[in-house]
Structure formats: C-alpha cells, structure tokens
Amino acid sequence: MAPWPELGDAQPNPDKYLEGAAGQQPTAPDKSKETNKTDNTEAPVTKIELLPSYSTATLIDEPTEVDDPWNLPTLQDSGIKWSERDTKGKILCFFQGIGRLILLLGFLYFFVCSLDILSSAFQLVGGKMAGQFFSNSSIMSNPLLGLVIGVLVTVLVQSSSTSTSIVVSMVSSSLLTVRAAIPIIMGANIGTSITNTIVALMQVGDRSEFRRAFAGATVHDFFNWLSVLVLLPVEVATHYLEIITQLIVESFHFKNGEDAPDLLKVITKPFTKLIVQLDKKVISQIAMNDEKAKNKSLVKIWCKTFTNKTQINVTVPSTANCTSPSLCWTDGIQNWTMKNVTYKENIAKCQHIFVNFHLPDLAVGTILLILSLLVLCGCLIMIVKILGSVLKGQVATVIKKTINTDFPFPFAWLTGYLAILVGAGMTFIVQSSSVFTSALTPLIGIGVITIERAYPLTLGSNIGTTTTAILAALASPGNALRSSLQIALCHFFFNISGILLWYPIPFTRLPIRMAKGLGNISAKYRWFAVFYLIIFFFLIPLTVFGLSLAGWRVLVGVGVPVVFIIILVLCLRLLQSRCPRVLPKKLQNWNFLPLWMRSLKPWDAVVSKFTGCFQMRCCCCCRVCCRACCLLCDCPKCCRCSKCCEDLEEAQEGQDVPVKAPETFDNITISREAQGEVPASDSKTECTAL
C-alpha cells in the first residue's frame, strides 16, 4: 500500500491544492496524464460529476477554469426576491420557512436520538466484550495495550464517557493505577471520533460533498492519532500528565459539587428511554472481574426497585475472613460469619420496547444498530436537503461569511481560538463531543463550514467533553472524587497538549492536510472510507492488542520493523516532494514499486469484482439505500430504480461534455425538476429564505 495512494507516474506536485494557512497539500494525481480515467475526483471541469440521485438530463456548460475541490460550493438563488412577492407569496414563503425550520429541528432531534440509540446498540453488541478488555492484567505494565483497549472499548460502546467511567471506577477500586489509566483515556479520545466518521459515510452519494464531509470528520481522527503518537511516548517517558494532575488534585481541597447539567439529554431522554434502557453498571462490573455480571443482561428490565438491607449467614474460608471476631462462629466444620446483604425487590418494569421480549443482548443490539443507522442516515439526508434548500443566496452568504471569515487584522489569529471556545461551549451544552462533531459533519459536507474552520471547532469539542467530565468528577462520591478528577484532568491536559502541538502554528496543522488527503482518496475510491474505518479503529488496535498479549518481545519484534518502514516511507516521500535531486533517479518517484503497492487502482478492481455480485441486488428500493450501496460497491449500475448510479455512469461516459455539478445548479428545484419530481412551474414558487 503506497503511503499516498494513486501516485501513478506523476511527479510529486506539492502545489496542487492550496490551503491557505494550513500549508501544503498531499499530492494529487496529474489528471492530464490519465485521460482515460472514468473517475472524476480531482478532475478538471470536463469531468465534474452529477449527483447520483439526480436526473440524466445533462446541462451543458461552457468549460471554466479548474476550481480547487476544497472551495465551498456556491448555491445561487433563482427564486423570486422578497420585494417582488405579493402578500400571498410572502405569507406562503414565511410559513414555508417556519415549516422548514420545524422540520430541520425535528430531524435534528431524531438525528441526536439516533446517535444515542446507536451508542446503546453498540453497548449491547460489544459492551460485555469491552468490559472484558479491561480485565486484562497486562494493562498495568503496557501503555500501548492500554491505548488500544481505550480505542476498542470506546468504539465498541460508542461512548467515551462510558469507557472513562469504567476506568474511574477501576482506579477508585485500586484495580488500576492513574499511570495505567492515562493511555486508556488517550485511546478513548481516539475511539470517540469514530461516530462522526460513520456519520460522514452517510453523505457518500455526492462525491464532492463526501470529500468535504469525510475530511471534516477525519480531521478529528487525525488530531487524536497524531496527539497520541507524540504525547504517549512523552507521557511514558516523563509522566507529565500524571504529575501535573496529581499536583492540581492535591493542591485543592475539593468539595463534592453538583452533577454536570444534562441539557440535551433532558430533551432526548424521554424519547430514547422509550426505545431501550440499559444497565451500564454491568459493563463496569465485568471490567472489575465480577463473574456474576457476565450472565447479566444489559437491557434494563426493572426501573423501580426496593432495596432492603438484611444480614445473612455466610461461610468463610477461615476465621480471618470474618466480618469481625464477634461475628464469627463455626458449626464444627465450616466457619461462618454474618454479612450485610442488600436485597433488591423488583416493583415496576421499565417502559421501553424491549422490556418484555427477553431477547439476548446481541439480538436487541443488532436490531437497534440497524434501525438507528437507518434513522441516522434518513435524518442526515433530510437535514442536508432542508439545509440545501434554506442555505441559498443571501442566507448562505451571510452564514458562510459569519462562520468562515476571520477577524480583521491584526486579530485574525484570534478567530480560531474563538472557534475553539465555541466548540467547547457547544459541546458542554449538548454534553457530547460525538453529537457536536456529528452535527458539524453534514454542514462541512454541504459547504457551510470550511475544514479550516471545522478544525478548531472540533478541537474545542474535545476540550468541551473534558470539562463535562471534570464537572461529573466533582460530583463523584468521596472515595471516587480524587481518582475521577485526576483522570478527567489528564483527559483535559492531554487535549490541551494536543492543541498546542497541532494548532497554534499554521505549519503544524497536519490533521487538516491529512484529512484532506484522505478526503481526496475516499472521494475517488469510496470503498476506501470503509477500509480506513476498519483499519484504524479495529484492525490496528486488535493487532496491537494481540501482539501485546503475546508479550513485549513479540510486540517490539513486529512493531519496530513496521515503524521503521513507515518512517522510511515518510522520509522518502518528504524528499521526493521537497528535494528530489538528492535522491537517485529510481527513488525520485514510486514507479520502482509494483502498481498494487503504489496505487489503489488494482485494489479498486479487486473490490469492484468482489462487490460485483451484490450490484444488481444491493439496492432497488430508495435513494437512502442507494447511498449505502454506492459507498460499498462504488458501482455505476447498482441502483436500477432510483437511477442514481446510472446517471453517474452516463455523466462519466460523456467526459468530453462538461456536466453541470449539483452545487452549481441555480437551486435545488432545478435538480428535482430535472428528475420529474416537481412540475417545472413549481420552481417559481420556491421560497429562498426563512
């Protein structure tokens, strides 16, 4: 696998994509040398693609200058101006706007709810396995193992707060030291960034939209991975996070505070608790080696219980195990003591769908996983559609300018830091970085927010989630207060350190460049997005986990050569792009490698062959299904009924004819009209602003 796929015969060209402050872009293929390509990712205007779900009607346009694919699309407004409308038109427009706003908020609500249900579904499917990861004794001595456990557990339970709370309970029970917990927290930080990457996959239908959305989502991933890459070795060597947080915890005499305010949960909980309710203590109990918990179901059945404390006689191995000398006796054979037991009497059952089904956790989890992903996908498509119809003309201009414009000189540098604060504040309000970054993803996709602006918002989100954790820690009971606060502070300072590494100096904003590079690749080969997700969030952590279990020697034996190869490739790539003359002619490009090692093209052929058998069957129902299909098989003919992929094929076949891209349509109505969805006359009644 080439470090920067699809290099082909092209000479490295560092100036292909410019990104302002963010510095140099990853090399993109030189399209002039590949005229036979049917793909149009970084294509000149002759190959701008048509959104798959739109009509086969090709709107001929004069070839214009090549645009940077990262430039935000301009949604021009062809609707009647407000001043030109009659009273009836104005009233109609007003109510249309209100209707759209209500719909938008409604879909946004169900979008957030589906994220919550998705988290529950993941916990039901993989929660117990996640708990068992924690009961591995090697975590104490192996920070790398701690890191991958943090990643895997958070990916499996889809909630960094769940994995963090397990770590806190383990630390306060002395099953884990703070030192051993820090890499797990770092891993949890990585794991939580999978949610918005999954959300980005839902925007796979439109290449340019997907490019932006996927890059916008993965900027979070890259920030976390790069931070860990630098800060984990630093922490292992210096224990700076442990020392700083210990000093803070010891220097303050904290009083137990109040719980962090549940602002968004207040609105979503009434709905989500009707779907499913989980007993999250079970995962913690499994993590703490409680054998009985392994047979417990995560699905909460009883919501109202009466707890009665009573004393029972229990046998103990020896008198030393007695509760106290006076509460110790024998029957002549066994030693007995009296133990306080809490007897739980079930009073009222929970009110959720699965309460009376008595299905295994895996079955409930699978059902919820499928349903929540469908709702998530549906809501996302509808949000994007509504935003697309609202954010046109003046509205779009105002919003884009407000969000993406910097402060005037000399305060331009402050804009990013304000965005960090906004991200932190918003995350604090919604109480979840996943929710905030997932809501951000479609906005990046449709071009309301630039990646450059989304980056500090995402970093702020990382900070926001740790402030929530600090507040939650302050509300912990006495015995857990110290450990939970120290861990929350470790999380906080880890993110602060990451920001200091990858934000203040524009040159160091590597996550943006890496995300854009991945965006380009994923827009061209859409299956690569899924491949990336599996590799980075499952395969690499599982491989490291497996190697760590085999012991340090095995881990080092396999890891060192791999790391050496990666460093070698990176150095070579750097030299190729900066000073190729230093290198021998053979090493000035990647042509010395076989094609499959330097390009994704052969792999694409393999994937296409593999998915070919599904193409005819994979979706013949709706556009939603088509988006999922197109993601998997990148196929031109997989959607017979919605015709979305056939359109794509036609657009690609007529390469010599410039096709008007969806983002250059005068407004969404034109595209719908072209499909025969609305009568042509309707375009005149389209309301352009709220």
Epitope: S326, C328, W336
Partner: antibody, heavy 120, light 107 residues
Framework: QVQLVQSGAEVKKPGASVKVSCKAS????????MHWVRQAPGQGLEWMGA????????SYNQKFKGRVTMTRDTSTSTVYMELSSLRSEDTAVYYC?????????????WGQGTLVTVSS | DIQMTQSPSSLSTSVGDRVTITCKAS??????VAWYQQKPGKSPKLLIY???TRHTGVPSRFSGSGSGTDFTLIISSLQPEDVATYYC?????????FGGGTKVEIK
C-alpha cells in the same frame, strides 16, 4: 422423632483401635453435621470432631488428629468414629451428637453414648 | 484453643431459689455460646444456644445472657428436676470447647 442409636460398649487393649457406630433416624441424615464428644469418668465434655454426611467433609480436634477418623454410610444413615492407638486415658463414654440448628455448633440431639474401656 | 472457665464448680441451694452460673471465655466469642444440662448417667441436653435462645421444650425459667467473654446461665426458680451438671460451650472457633461444668444440688 430424631433418634441416634450407638453401638454397644467396647473393651480394648492399649494400642488397639475402636470403631463406634451411630445410626440416625427421624430426620434427613445428609443435611446436618454429626459431632463426636467424649466424657471421661467424672470429667467434663470434650469435642473430638465432626462430619458433614452430605459430602463427607470432616473437621477434627487437633488433639486427636492422626488418631481419629470419621466416616459415614449414607445408605444406612450411619456415622462411624474410629480411634486408633488407644491409651488408658481414652477410656470414656463416646457420644455422637447431631446439630440440627443449622449453621451453629450447638448440638441438640445426642446418642445414648458408648463406653470404651482401654485396659491391659 | 479457647478456654471456657465455669464457676462455681458446684453449688447447693434450695428449691425455688435463683441460680446463676457464669462462664468466662479466654477470648472474644461473640454470642456463639450454648448451655447444656446433663443428669447423672444420661446424655447431655441442649438448653440454650446463641447465648440466650432457648431450645425447643426448654422451660422459661432457664435464661442466658452475655457477649464477648462473659456469659451467664440463670435458673430463675430452681426445681427438683433441675439437679444436674451444667456445661457451657463455645462454637466461635474450632475446636469447640466446653467449660468444666457446674454441679447443681438441692440442700
């Protein structure tokens, strides 16, 4: 009603072994511990050990360890106590006693006792 | 082993009198103490367990008290049939141990 019937009196020579039996009836034999307590003439009571007939688990007084063996036969609801390497000071009345007060070492039903005389 | 020291070793009193027998443990035994009555030539009979719980069929004139190391058996009104030797027993630790016994006689 609960009854514990012990085997008859025994006269043994020093160094020999004696095996006293105790047949239980009137209750679930395997459920309750069976204790052996002895009483030397004109002396107090001395606990020798106990057996749980359900599993055959035993517990002995350290003083008799190595010399005493307690066994049970669940088919006949009988418990046996064998004392080896007899000495003259082992002359005593040997009682089997059942503890039906669950989880306690208080014994509520006693056999009639078996007199074991050790004499050369 | 836990030593159980009973006192007095014997006592002679009249019918209807209140009789108090004490038992001292060499270490804390909580409330794991039982009292037995043994009439001459007979097997012992359980009177009280858990320091103060009367066994089935035991007359109410027999009562027990105490905790830790000091225990007492009280016969509130001595009857002719109460003439016997009384033993205390601890079942806090293995081996179970008995007191030396208190012989109760009627004057």
């Amino acid at each position: 009603q609960v009854q514990l019937v012990q085997s008859g009196a025994e006269v043994k020579k020093p160094g020999a072994s004696v095996k006293v039996s105790c047949k239980a009836s009137g209750y679930t034999f395997i459920t309750y511990n069976m204790h052996w307590v002895r009483q030397a003439p004109g002396q107090g009571l001395e606990w020798m050990g106990a057996i749980y007939p359900g599993s055959g688990d035993t517990s002995y007084n350290q003083k008799f360890k190595g010399r005493v063996t307690m066994t049970r036969d669940t088919s006949t609801s009988t418990v046996y106590m064998e004392l080896s390497s007899l000495r003259s000071e082992d002359t005593a009345v040997y009682y089997c006693a059942s503890s039906t007060i669950i989880t306690t070492g208080a014994v509520d039903y006693w056999g009639q006792g078996t007199l074991v005389t050790v004499s050369s | 082993d836990i030593q159980m020291t009973q006192s007095p070793s014997s006592l002679s009193t009249s019918v209807g009198d209140r009789v108090t027998i004490t038992c001292k443990a060499s270490q804390d035994v909580g409330t794991a103490v039982a009292w037995y009555q043994q009439k001459p030539g007979k097997s012992p009979k359980l009177l009280i367990y858990w320091t103060s719980t009367r066994h089935t069929g035991v007359p109410s004139r027999f009562s027990g008290s105490g905790s830790g190391t000091d225990f007492t058996l009280i016969i509130s009104s001595l009857q002719p049939e109460d003439v016997a030797t009384y033993y205390c027993q601890q079942y806090s630790r293995i081996p179970l141990t008995f007191g030396g016994g208190t012989k109760v006689e009627i004057k």
